[in-house]
Amino acid sequence: DTQEKEVRAMVGSDVELSCACPEGSRFDLNDVYVYWQTSESKTVVTYHIPQNSSLENVDSRYRNRALMSPAGMLRGDFSLRLFNVTPQDEQKFHCLVLSQSLGFQEVLSVEVTLHVAANFSVPVVSAPHSPSQDELTFTCTSINGYPRPNVYWINKTDNSLLDQALQNDTVFLNMRGLYDVVSVLRIARTPSVNIGCCIENVLLQQNLTVGSQTGNDIGERDKITENPVSTGEKNAATWS
């Protein structure tokens, strides 16, 4: 039976995809055949074949970036170290271990789902401008996050969510494979508006919130505060 596991990694970090026999297991390098590949596309990630130190069949995206330890293999640990994780690594990986002395019997089969995450930048909310006499427009920008974010606009007066019909979100996949988001909010002009833009990263359970206030008395200052709330908020930046 194939074991199933999940692991999470930040973009740019190193991650271990676990594939190991029970403690106390012992293997010989000249007896085990180990294959790591992606489950869907069957891309060759790395492998160990006795008496073959060449890894010429490894896909170029993983060469010198996906490695197993011979020392670990002797102890039944066929885990994969994936260095410098990228968003493109978010997929299912399959580890298969066979023993030659057991007639190429399957010793271990593990499927590891890798979830990749990256922190979005602290949102920047542009100063409001008036396309018309009775309307205000705010723009909120946040970049270099993963996975695709959710964007919410908040009425800071009572912390209520504004109607999503009032916002227009554009999400770009940038050159690094990370997401940039621009959200434009259009609301009716009122004497004093205190709103916030919230970028939610579901995988990291992280909300980044930035406030913007309009009125006769706008004293702008920056501050970043830790502000955990029920939505799992970890970092909040408030401008008021």
């Epitope: 012992r26 390098l29 330890s69 011979p70």
Partner: antibody, heavy 121, light 107 residues
Framework: QVQLVESGGGVVQPGRSLRLSCAAS????????MHWVRQAPGKGLEWVAV????????YYADSVEGRFTISRDNSKNTLYLQMNSLRAEDTAVFYC??????????????WGQGTLVTVSS | EIVLTQSPATLSLSPGERATLSCRAS??????LAWYQQKPGQAPRLLIY???NRATGIPARFSGSGSGTDFTLTISSLEPEDFAVYYC?????????FGQGTKVEIK
């Protein structure tokens, strides 16, 4: 050039403890697995312990399992070996050695000059 | 545990001569065998790994061959600095083990 310098050896009574250090320079310490290997006087070499490049995994020879602890401080480029419950048969020159590969192949490509540990009452 | 037996225990040769050192494993270690040189009062030095790959900076007169259980280290023409003890080591099985050494001395 790669340099490994061991320290902390000396004479110690059976049952007591000792901590060896190995200061590394001339290479990116945090990118290599590291080992301790020992050599009893006039005898051959015996592998003792290994630690992964990031300290995440450690393995030991059966003869020292449960008594010795290998560790590293990558910010200080230093490898350690904490030796407890020392026995007369632990008397040896202890070498720290660098593994050839980040993922620990069990090939020792650079060695320190060694530090002598004598366990005697 | 794999036992590595080196022969001869001592090899007496003159500078310029060819040295042939043997290492036999108690069971197959494939090609996962290394050779080290150790001079008196010094640390070992890696010469050959995975049976036949010369380590960085090792002169071409050192060569390794063999696979399975029988391995050979050859020094094609002995230089004065080559007189030392030579150890083989396997990494195919747990634990990693060394041979007892072959001493190459000046005849």
């Amino acid at each position: 050039q790669v340099q490994l310098v061991e320290s902390g050896g000396g004479v110690v009574q059976p049952g007591r403890s000792l901590r060896l250090s190995c200061a590394a320079s001339g290479f990116t310490f945090s990118s290599y697995g590291m080992h301790w290997v020992r050599q009893a006087p006039g005898k051959g070499l015996e592998w003792v312990a290994v630690i992964w490049y990031d300290g995440s995994k450690k393995y030991y020879a059966d003869s020292v399992e449960g008594r010795f602890t290998i560790s590293r401080d990558n910010s200080k480029n230093t490898l350690y070996l904490q030796m407890n419950s020392l026995r007369a048969e632990d008397t040896a020159v202890f070498y720290c050695a660098r593994d050839l590969n980040i993922m620990v192949w069990g090939i020792f490509d650079y060695w320190g000059q060694g530090t002598l540990v004598t366990v005697s009452s | 545990e794999i036992v590595l037996t080196q022969s001869p225990a001592t090899l007496s040769l003159s500078p310029g001569e060819r040295a042939t050192l043997s290492c036999r494993a108690s069971q197959s270690v494939s090609s996962y065998l290394a050779w080290y040189q150790q001079k008196p009062g010094q640390a070992p030095r890696l010469l050959i790994y995975d049976a036949s790959n010369r380590a960085t900076g090792i002169p071409a007169r050192f060569s390794g061959s063999g696979s399975g259980t029988d391995f050979t280290l050859t020094i094609s023409s002995l230089e004065p600095e080559d007189f030392a003890v030579y150890y083989c080591q396997q990494r195919n099985n747990w634990p990693w083990t060394f041979g007892q050494g072959t001493k190459v001395e000046i005849k």
